[in-house]
């Protein structure tokens, strides 16, 4: 049950990213740290970097409400039991500032890519009976 809800939340985050991609022209065109090709065991650390990034609505009016709601939902914190499955190598993971900075469109694309990777890992670990995802 909890595992299923976790998957639903992760997929929901992808949907939120997809919704925000419809509004890239209404986002502040700021360059944000965007992890890519994240090394194994640093996925939750990279996830945290995406959540900390200051993605903002340009307050152009029309879509401001849905953008702000979506950004806030993107920052929903998973329980600490998940957010690491206590990733063993987290101390050696890159800091957020060390990742390449990208404009909102690429930032969202990379976030989606990471989420897809994490879902894939989660499904694989369940298939192989492991809890370490």
């Amino acid at each position: 049950q909890g595992q299923d809800r976790h998957m639903i939340r992760m997929r929901q985050l992808i949907d939120i990213v997809d919704q925000l991609k419809n509004y890239v022209n209404d986002l502040v065109p700021e360059f944000l740290p965007a992890p890519e090709d994240v090394e194994t065991n640093c996925e939750w650390s990279a996830f945290s970097c995406f959540q900390k990034a200051q993605l903002k609505s340009a307050n152009t009016g029309n879509n401001e409400r849905i953008i702000n709601v979506s950004i806030k939902k993107l920052k929903r914190k998973p329980p600490s039991t998940n957010a690491g499955r206590r990733q063993k190598h987290r101390l050696t993971c890159p800091s957020c500032d060390s990742y390449e900075k990208k404009p909102p469109k690429e930032f969202l694309e990379r976030f989606k890519s990471l989420l897809q990777k994490m879902i894939h890992q989660h499904l694989s670990s369940r298939t192989h009976g492991s809890e370490d995802s």
């Epitope: 949907d15 919704q19 409400r65 806030k72 914190k77």
Partner: antibody, heavy 126, light 106 residues
């Protein structure tokens, strides 16, 4: 069972104020965002306002911005709508509704309004 | 702001028939953000479908939702007497409602 009960409606003169309340029971009120939605006689549904589960953010329809204030008291499991400078066009049935997306990672995940009150009628007339 | 346009305004059908209701958005909507509600006279609305295609708790399987992008559909496979009501689509996050489609008995 999960329930929302609105109160505070009535007949009021234009320019006056009214405060609506919505009492929640049967669920963890503090984990859910809450909405007010209204329906003028013979018309469709109009979203009015939303408040985040912890009160940290509030959003309003343009038609009520600056006149209406949404608030909540999580210790009392109650949602409020303070309506000032009322106009004839504010005449409607006002519903409170629970946002189906819980703040709990393992909680409800519905992007929709999944629980509604029975509504309270507000009539603005001189 | 997004505009949701529902069609037809009124649908006149007989019990047992299939009802197809349309909701068109003025800009692209992620499927997760599209919901459908049913409202009967004198009653509060009820959530039918969330995420464009997922039935809410307790909703019979004769109700189904589909679509993506700007075009969404609510289908009632075989109308029961209790299904005659007004149906609204809504975009989550902006919380904009369509103007509604009334399904009435022919």
């Amino acid at each position: 069972q999960v329930q929302l009960v609105e109160s505070g409606g009535g007949v009021v003169q234009p320019g006056r104020s009214l405060r609506l309340s919505c009492a929640a029971s049967g669920f963890t009120f503090s984990a859910y965002g809450m909405h007010w939605v209204r329906q003028a006689p013979g018309k469709g549904l109009e979203w009015v306002a939303f408040i985040w589960y912890d009160g940290s953010d509030k959003y309003y329809a343009d038609s009520v911005k600056g006149r209406f204030t949404i608030s909540r008291d999580n210790s009392k499991n109650t949602l409020y709508l303070q309506m000032n400078s009322l106009r004839a066009e504010d005449t409607a049935v006002y519903y409170c509704a629970r946002d189906g997306d819980s703040s709990d990672w393992y909680g409800d995940y519905y992007f929709g309004m999944d629980v509604w009150g029975q509504g309270t009628t507000v009539t603005v007339s001189s | 702001e997004i505009v949701l346009t529902q069609s037809p305004g009124t649908l006149s059908l007989s019990p047992g028939e299939r009802a197809t209701l349309s909701c068109r958005a003025s800009q692209s909507v992620s499927s997760s953000y599209l919901a459908w509600y049913q409202q009967k006279p004198g009653q509060a609305p009820r959530l039918l479908i969330y995420g464009a295609s997922s039935r809410a708790t307790g909703i019979p399987d004769r109700f189904s939702g589909s679509g993506s992008g700007t075009d969404f559909t609510l289908t009632i496979s075989r109308l029961e007497p209790e299904d005659f009501a007004v149906y609204y689509c809504q975009q989550y996050g902006s919380w904009t409602f369509g103007q509604g489609t009334k399904v009435e008995i022919k």
